[in-house]
Structures are given as structure tokens and as C-alpha cells.
């Protein structure tokens, strides 16, 4: 039995998979900030988690996926305000009783030290200093990501 949050996550991921392939992204679009091989977009407004997920999808991106603690720290360094929380692409899967990224993978317990409960309708937010479990209905800011395409020894003609 999937929760409404899980279903929303799956639906959006499937619709993203159905879209036609686009050429790789070599530079971050305007308003997006580059962090290593990603482009990040920090929202100005607030939304519950599923609306944030949908907003990123409309921008041909996804809610932020964090690979490891190092990436978390670098992302947090871009947050200038201690008091602001941002949704990322991680929520609690009731059916699997585990934290699940929106790409379908499960959280490695060593990656993030989450403050708060792991329970139904819980989603993960990050601040400048910490990682929190919040009710998914809470309205906070969010972070979208786009992956940059690595360029390996390719020679491009002058455009």
C-alpha cells in the first residue's frame, strides 16, 4: 500500500522517464548555481513536499539528491540563513519502512544524521547545519537539481 506522497513521487518520476531525451547540460541555466557536477536552484517561496517535487519536475529537474556527507556539507555551505529549511528528494516509505530517495534508492544510514522520527508522511529537509525529518505537509522552501553532463576530451566546433 503506497502513501499519497509515495504515489506522487512515483508518478512524477515515471512522467520524467517518458519525456524525450534532451541533449546533455553543459552549463547551468540562469538563476541556477553550480555545485560540482550539478546545478542547484533554491526556491524563494514555500510549499509542502509534494508540491515542491512537482515544481522541480516542471523545471525539468528533480528535488535534490545527496550522494554522501561531503555533498551535504557543500550544499549546506550555499545556505546563507541559519533559520531556513529546504526540502530535498527523500521521504519515508511506509511500505518499506525506510527512507527512500525519489530515484528509488534507499538511504545509506551513514550518509545523513537525521533529527526527528522516521514515520509515515515524513519528509527530509536540510538547513545550514542539520538534516531534519518534517511532516511532508509542512510548507518550507526546496532545492531543485539538474545534472551537468561531464565533457570528456570532446572537441566542439566554434558555435
Amino acid at each position: 500500500q503506497k502513501s499519497s506522497i509515495e504515489k506522487c513521487s512515483v508518478d512524477i518520476q515515471q512522467s520524467r522517464n517518458k519525456t524525450t531525451e534532451r541533449p546533455g547540460l553543459l552549463n547551468c541555466p540562469i538563476y541556477w548555481q553550480q555545485l560540482r557536477e550539478k546545478c542547484l536552484l533554491f526556491s524563494h517561496t514555500v510549499n509542502p513536499w509534494n508540491n515542491s517535487l512537482a515544481d522541480c519536475s516542471t523545471k525539468e529537474s528533480s528535488l535534490l539528491l545527496i550522494r554522501d556527507k561531503d555533498e551535504l556539507i557543500h550544499t549546506q555551505n550555499l545556505i546563507r540563513d541559519k533559520a531556513i529549511l529546504f526540502w530535498i528528494g527523500l521521504n519515508f516509505s511506509l511500505s518499506e519502512k525506510n527512507w527512500k530517495w525519489i530515484n528509488g534508492s534507499f538511504l545509506n544510514s551513514n550518509d545523513l544524521e537525521i533529527r526527528g522520527d522516521a514515520k509515515e508522511n515524513s519528509c527530509i529537509s536540510i538547513s545550514q547545519t542539520s538534516v531534519y525529518s518534517e511532516y511532508c505537509s509542512t510548507e518550507i522552501r526546496w532545492i531543485c537539481q539538474k545534472e551537468l553532463t561531464p565533457v570528456r576530451n570532446k572537441v566542439y566546433p566554434d558555435s
Epitope: 541555466p29 540562469i30 538563476y31 548555481q33 536552484l41 533554491f42 524563494h44 517561496t45 523545471k59 550555499l78 545556505i79 546563507r80 540563513d81 531556513i84
Partner: antibody
Framework: QVQLLESGPGLVKPSETLSLTCTVS????????WSWIRQPPGKGLEWIGY???????NYNPSLKSRVTISVDTSETQFSLKLSSVTAADTAVYYC??????WGGGFDYWGQGTLVTVSS | EIVLTQSPGTLSLSPGERATLSCRAS???????LAWYQQKPGQAPRLLIY???SRATGIPDRFSGSGSGTDFTLTISRLEPEDFAVYYC?????????FGGGTKVEIK
């Protein structure tokens, strides 16, 4: 309603640095991207660059080597510095705000300040 | 960079007439990130339309925008005396942000 007010010298000598400040009132400096736009007398509009409250900036490549935009969140101000100016930099300089991908276009503008480059 | 070409350069019309202003982009404007502004002498530009077709707050419904990709249009259904001004289009989907050269709508 957000209000923007430009301030700075109206006359700058060639080869010197043009410095302007935009003061933001009635709005959160954390909720917008803050741009400088200029308009030479009788001509069109040219975007110079923007800054986000985090300090992340984006500049027009045509001016990038000469431009610095900075933000002071505690004073709710952002500033423009344009180095090595010439007569071609004579223009009305506007500060403006936009919400990036969540808004659309520059919804708030300062009244503009004319900067003349002359010896 | 995306170059925006506005036409005509000048439009001479009478109050009550319909004005149709064109803005053509050198490449596709992503997500219809296109805005229109009105500027009167000695004043800052005023946002009219964003997202190609959405009216900004407080803008009368005689102003409408349409188009996508590379071709965009601003229509003023019935010109009022206060509408005679210069109109600029602007794209905000790619860096650098760019403006069109403007269309002057003058009284015939």
C-alpha cells in the same frame, strides 16, 4: 510593495570606477534576484548582471571583466561597481528585482540614476 | 546569447485602434520565459506581461501576450491615450538576460 532607490555620483571621469548602491525597502532581500540594468540616452535596455542574497552572481559577458555586484543583507542594499569607464558607459542606471524562474521579468524598478562619464 | 528583434520599430496609430507588436527570438526561449514592458519618457520600464501571456499585477486586460518558441506578440486591443509609449520584450530563460530594441507606439 518593494521599493528600490539608486544612489551614487552622477559624474564619473574616464578610466575611473563607477559605483552605485540600491537600497531595498518593504521587501525581503532573500526573496528576489537583484539586477542592474542600464539605458544609454535615447537607446534600449541592457542587463548588466544580478546577485542573489547568498552572494551568487551572474554577469552579462559583454561587461563581465569590468563588473562586480555585491550584496549587503544586513543593510538590505546591493551595489554595482563598473571599472575603467568610458563615454560609452554614460547611461541611466536602474536597479530592479525579479523572482527568477518562479516569477517573470523585472516587477520592481528603481527610478533610475543618470551617470555621465566625462572629464 | 538570445537576440530579440522587435518590429515594427515605430507604430503610428490612433486612440481606440488595435496595436500588434512583434518580438522574434534568434533561438527558442525556454519555457516561454518572455516578458513585455512599457516605458514612458523619464520613467523606469513597467512590467506588463510575463511568461509570454500572463498579465502582471494591476495591468488592464486590454493588454495581452501570446506566442512561444521564437515568435511572441503583444496586443493592445484598444489604445488609450496613456498607452502611447515604447514597448520592450525581454527573455529570462537564458544568460545573459536580453531585451529587444523596442517598438515606439506613437499617436497618428
Amino acid at each position: 510593495q518593494v521599493q528600490l532607490l539608486e544612489s551614487g555620483p552622477g559624474l564619473v571621469k574616464p578610466s575611473e570606477t563607477l559605483s552605485l548602491t540600491c537600497t531595498v525597502s518593504n521587501g525581503s532581500i532573500r526573496s528576489y534576484y537583484w539586477s542592474w540594468i542600464r539605458q544609454p540616452p535615447g537607446k534600449g535596455l541592457e542587463w548588466i548582471g544580478y546577485i542573489y542574497y547568498s552572494g551568487s552572481a551572474n554577469y552579462n559577458p559583454s561587461l563581465k571583466s569590468r563588473v562586480t555586484i555585491s550584496v549587503d543583507t544586513s543593510e538590505t542594499q546591493f551595489s554595482l561597481k563598473l571599472s575603467s569607464v568610458t563615454a560609452a558607459d554614460t547611461a541611466v542606471y536602474y536597479c530592479a528585482s525579479d523572482r527568477g524562474p518562479w516569477g517573470g521579468g523585472f516587477d520592481y524598478w528603481g527610478q533610475g540614476t543618470l551617470v555621465t562619464v566625462s572629464s | 546569447e538570445i537576440v530579440l528583434t522587435q518590429s515594427p520599430g515605430t507604430l503610428s496609430l490612433s486612440p481606440g485602434e488595435r496595436a500588434t507588436l512583434s518580438c522574434r527570438a534568434s533561438q527558442s526561449v525556454s519555457s516561454s520565459y518572455l516578458a513585455w514592458y512599457q516605458q514612458k519618457p523619464g520613467q523606469a520600464p513597467r512590467l506588463l506581461i510575463y511568461g509570454a501571456s500572463s498579465r502582471a499585477t494591476g495591468i488592464p486586460d486590454r493588454f495581452s501576450g501570446s506566442g512561444s518558441g521564437t515568435d511572441f506578440t503583444l496586443t493592445i486591443s484598444r489604445l488609450e491615450p496613456e498607452d502611447f509609449a515604447v514597448y520592450y520584450c525581454q527573455q529570462y530563460g537564458n544568460s545573459p538576460l536580453t531585451f529587444g530594441g523596442g517598438t515606439k507606439v506613437e499617436i497618428k
